[in-house]
């Protein structure tokens, strides 16, 4: 299953992937040469009981959501990235050398309840 | 990194793995023959800014936590399972056949910020 995709004005209450562009320069991350900004996306929303298929949930999340329904001390499952991808970056390392490399887990491709 | 492990009385505020035993009979899941209960564990706690190494965070979580520090509309990273394991189960399927199989993602082995 591929989870839900939303735009920033969506009224969806459930776990969903939202667009987010991150600007490295705005945060003063000047050791990053390129890209200066990238589409990171993020996950947000509820993981309600009972967890439905389209919320792309793990078995543990289904069990935990059931436990939460009778014991609120145990948290609900969390809306979190379930598929991520890397981006290629050009950056200075700690020794002031320029590095070109694939940085893992930088982009959220899919969200789910975990 | 292996994340933090806590007991149920811990005052730790950060993302941590806690013990949780799930009793299938208590939830009326009578199609499960064995085990009747198992150690599932769960993740709970904060993913504070800045994210530290022992919180076992993805690169995206580090970026998202930074974004949240200046824009609270973007949620913080979530404390969620980062390593899971299966359990072997004996259960009735929908056709009333007894199945023995390995059910994935049933036990939380490690928690982190994601």
């Amino acid at each position: 299953d591929f989870g839900l995709d939303c735009d920033e004005h969506s009224t969806e209450s459930r776990c969903c992937r939202y667009p987010l562009t991150v600007d490295f320069e705005a945060f003063g991350w000047d050791w990053i040469i390129a890209p200066k900004r990238y589409k990171a996306n993020y996950c947000s929303g509820e993981c309600p009981f009972p967890l439905a298929d389209h919320l792309n949930s793990t078995n543990h999340a289904i069990v935990q959501t059931l436990v939460n329904s009778v014991n609120s001390k145990i948290p609900k499952a969390c809306c979190t990235p379930t598929k991520m991808s890397p981006i290629n970056m050009l950056y200075f390392n700690g020794k002031e050398q320029i590095i070109y490399g694939k940085i893992p887990a930088m982009v959220v491709d899919r969200c789910g309840c975990s | 990194d292996f994340g933090l492990d806590c007991d149920e009385h811990s005052t730790e505020s950060r993302c941590c793995r806690y013990p949780l035993t799930v009793d299938f009979e208590a939830f009326g899941w009578d199609w499960i023959i064995a085990p009747k209960r198992y150690k599932a564990n769960y993740c709970s706690g904060e993913c504070p800014f800045p994210l530290a190494d022992h919180l076992n965070s993805t690169n995206h979580a580090i970026v998202q936590t930074l974004v949240n520090s200046v824009n609270s509309k973007i949620p913080k990273a979530c404390c969620t399972p980062t390593k899971m394991s299966p359990i072997n189960m004996l259960y009735f399927n929908g056709k009333e056949q007894i199945i023995y199989g390995k059910i994935p993602a049933m036990v939380v082995d490690r928690c982190g910020c994601s």
Epitope: P75 | S10, T11, E12, S13, R14, E46, P48, K76
Partner: antibody, heavy 122, light 107 residues
């Protein structure tokens, strides 16, 4: 100046309810864990309840579990304690306190409000 | 729950003298212990956290020591403003628990 100001105390009959409020000024309370601590007249301090920075996690003393609910309103910079099924032994001054989170653990209170008196009596 | 026991209940000391207050935990709390001072009609004030770290603005005459189950608060030379009730509190396990307090009074 960093300040916490409680309100909502008063006289209530056994079995009744009260909602205490704590207003934070001089700092953003949403960036801190917070607690309620009480002190019966002439007695020592007793921790009542705590809430995490996000508000997701809440903690209670056994003596109030199931009767009291801690919550926060980030937009208003407020902390609350909803007290139901009140008993005579809940009579105390109730303080809200900001948590220093020393070593990331809950329970070091560096800023306290002036307190609000709750009297449970018929 | 962890029971915190303070001794003595009352300590009579002359100004300028040293005061030693004890706090014992029913089980180990590591170094997760704080000391508060409370004067009559006032709110508690954080003195020491982490068993031995002075809070911001606390004079050097206050010092904390100990770990595990045995802790001490020492006031090296009592000033008139130090006469108050002192509470220890553990923050190692839920529920957070306080000692019954030690009242330091003028001898």
């Amino acid at each position: 100046e960093v300040q916490l100001l409680e309100s909502g105390g008063g006289l209530v009959q056994p079995g009744g309810s009260l909602r205490l409020s704590c207003a934070a000024s001089g700092f953003t309370s949403i960036t801190y864990a917070m607690s309620w601590v009480r002190q019966a007249p002439g007695k020592g301090l007793e921790w009542v309840s705590a809430i995490s920075v996000s508000g997701t996690n809440t903690y209670y003393a056994d003596s109030v579990k199931g009767r009291f609910t801690i919550s926060r309103d980030k937009s208003k910079n407020m902390l609350y304690l909803q007290m139901n099924s009140l008993r005579a032994e809940d009579t105390a001054v109730y303080y809200c306190a900001k948590d220093l989170l020393h070593n990331w653990k809950y329970g070091t209170f560096d800023i306290w409000g002036q307190g609000t008196m709750v009297t449970v009596s018929s | 729950e962890i029971v915190m026991t303070q001794s003595p209940a009352t300590l009579s000391v002359s100004p300028g003298e040293r005061a030693t207050l004890s706090c014992r935990a029913s089980q180990s709390v590591d170094s997760n212990l704080v000391w508060y001072q409370q004067k009559p009609g006032q709110v508690p004030r954080l003195l020491i956290y982490g068993a031995s770290t002075r809070a911001t603005g606390i004079p050097a005459r206050f010092s904390g020591s100990g770990s595990g189950t045995e802790f001490t608060l020492t006031i090296s030379s009592l000033q008139s403003e130090d006469f108050a009730v002192y509470y220890c509190q553990q923050y190692n396990k839920w529920p957070l628990t306080f000692g019954g307090g030690t009242k330091v009074e003028i001898k």
